[in-house]
């Protein structure tokens, strides 16, 4: 005979645990239903009645299946110098991130504790890895045959134009200059930009030092030695 499907609340078999989306109520000594995300336990279960769930009130949320008596409060509204990337709903907390051009250099439980400006790669260097919400830009020297003549947190190294006759050879920070005859191939005018980073939740890791104009925040452990400031070009 197939086993009977137990409906909550039910007493679990000795040594067994409650099923998925159920919890063991110590008072009733029964397996009872959890409340779904966006809800909380309004009335706890008894031996004869299951958990009564209710929706979270405005500005409160539960993200997981739960049996909490009250929903959690959403964080305070994002300040004018932050961007709300996730609104407060019944199922998720508000998330505030750094303003455009900045990244979160130091995270806290919910959101960001310290924003820092995205590193700008100086002429002769291009973006090797774009910045994200939680990591800085990584710059790299422009390889032979490529250049960047901007100070930018988005521009990559781009190829020198190829000339029939070169007037001035290109270098890492300057494009080649052709004689009055037109080049055989030329890049479209204007700098090449990397797209702005999409929202990511990756853990911030310190990039390798690269030249820049925006000094990054360097972190030390309490008694550790002080490394040189990352990628700083000074004043």
């Amino acid at each position: 005979l197939p086993a009977q499907v137990a409906f909550t609340p039910y007493a679990p078999e000795p040594g067994s645990t409650c099923r998925l989306r159920e919890y063991y109520d110590q008072t009733a000594q029964m397996c009872c239903s959890k409340c779904s995300p966006g809800q909380h336990a309004k009335v706890f279960c008894t031996k004869t009645s299951d958990t009564v769930c209710d929706s979270c009130e405005d500005s409160t949320y539960t993200q997981l299946w739960n049996w909490v008596p009250e929903c959690l409060s959403c964080g305070s509204r994002c300040s004018s110098d932050q961007v709300e990337t996730q609104a407060c709903t019944r199922e998720q907390n508000r998330i505030c991130t750094c303003r455009p051009g900045w990244y979160c250099a130091l995270s806290k439980q919910e959101g960001c504790r310290l924003c820092a400006p995205l590193r700008k790669c100086r002429p002769g260097f291009g973006v090797a890895r774009p910045g994200t919400e939680t990591s800085d830009v990584v710059c790299k020297p422009c390889a032979p045959g490529t250049f960047s003549n901007t100070t930018s947190s988005t521009d990559i190294c781009r190829p020198h134009q190829i000339c029939n006759v070169v007037a001035i050879p290109g270098n890492a920070s300057m494009d080649a200059v052709c004689t009055s005859t037109s080049p055989t191939r030329s890049m479209a005018p204007g700098a090449v930009h990397l797209p702005q980073p999409v929202s990511t939740r990756s853990q911030h890791t310190q990039p390798t030092p690269e030249p820049s104009t925006a000094p990054s925040t360097s972190f030390l452990l309490p008694m550790g030695p002080s490394p040189p400031a990352e990628g700083s070009t000074g004043d």
């Epitope: 300040s79 051009g101 439980q109 960001c112 310290l114």
Partner: antibody, heavy 119, light 107 residues
């Protein structure tokens, strides 16, 4: 209400060390960054560094990294700054300060601790 | 390090006057500039951040403006209680630096 209470005035001899304290209240201690700022008599303000009790991260102004050491005692919600090998140049008022948001402009300041280095 | 220069150490004004205190950064700080007021024997008080955002409780006679490397704090109608030292500070990147201060004196 956020409050930063600093320890009292100190008179110390050249070459000695001193430990200043900044006790925070009115918020979750591990969620705020505490900064230290120096002000010499009749002069401007200099940022020394910050301590983040949430993860024990520290950041020093290069100019002060051999002078100041920042630590904290989470049980008493207090951040400390130890200054070593004191000279008359270290005579100043030292403020602790913090900021509510993730950008470093200081909404909250301690009352300041006057340090006098004199023989 | 970014150097913040307040060219006027002292400024003399009269009650009711409009006064502007200037601050120049040694490099572009992307409007990440704050202004503080400090009275004798007191801690500095935040007035303005992000160049032009007034801090809670700051009277609207205080306004900030600027971009790039040049920033200004303006008091539209000076009051006797505005006699104080005023500091600019960039909150762009470490090390965070302050201007040398401008002392506002009432004639």
């Amino acid at each position: 209400k956020v409050q930063l209470q600093q320890s009292g005035a100190e008179l110390v001899k050249p070459g000695a060390s001193v430990k200043l304290s900044c006790k925070a209240s009115g918020y979750t201690f591990t969620e705020s960054i505490i900064h230290w700022v120096k002000q010499r008599s009749g002069q401007g303000l200099e940022w020394i560094g910050w301590f983040y009790p949430g993860s024990d991260n520290i950041n020093y102004n290069e100019k002060f990294k051999d002078k100041a050491t920042l630590t904290a005692d989470k049980s008493s919600s207090t951040v400390y700054m130890e200054l070593t090998r004191l000279t008359s140049e270290d005579s100043a008022v030292y403020f602790c300060a913090s900021h509510e948001g993730p950008y470093v402009y200081f909404d909250y300041w301690g009352q300041g601790t006057t340090l006098t280095v004199s023989s | 390090d970014i150097v913040m220069t307040q060219s006027h150490k002292f400024m003399s004004t009269s009650v009711g006057d409009r006064v502007s205190i200037t601050c120049k950064a040694s490099q572009d700080v992307s409007t990440a500039v704050a202004w503080y007021q400090q009275k004798p024997g007191q801690s500095p008080k935040l007035l303005i951040y992000w160049t032009s955002t007034r801090h809670t409780g700051v009277p609207d006679r205080f306004t900030g403006s600027g971009s790039g490397t040049d920033y200004t704090l303006t008091i539209s109608s000076v009051q006797a209680e505005d006699l104080a030292l005023y500091y600019c500070q960039h909150h762009y990147s470490t090390p965070y630096t302050f201007g040398g201060g401008t002392k506002l004196e009432i004639q």
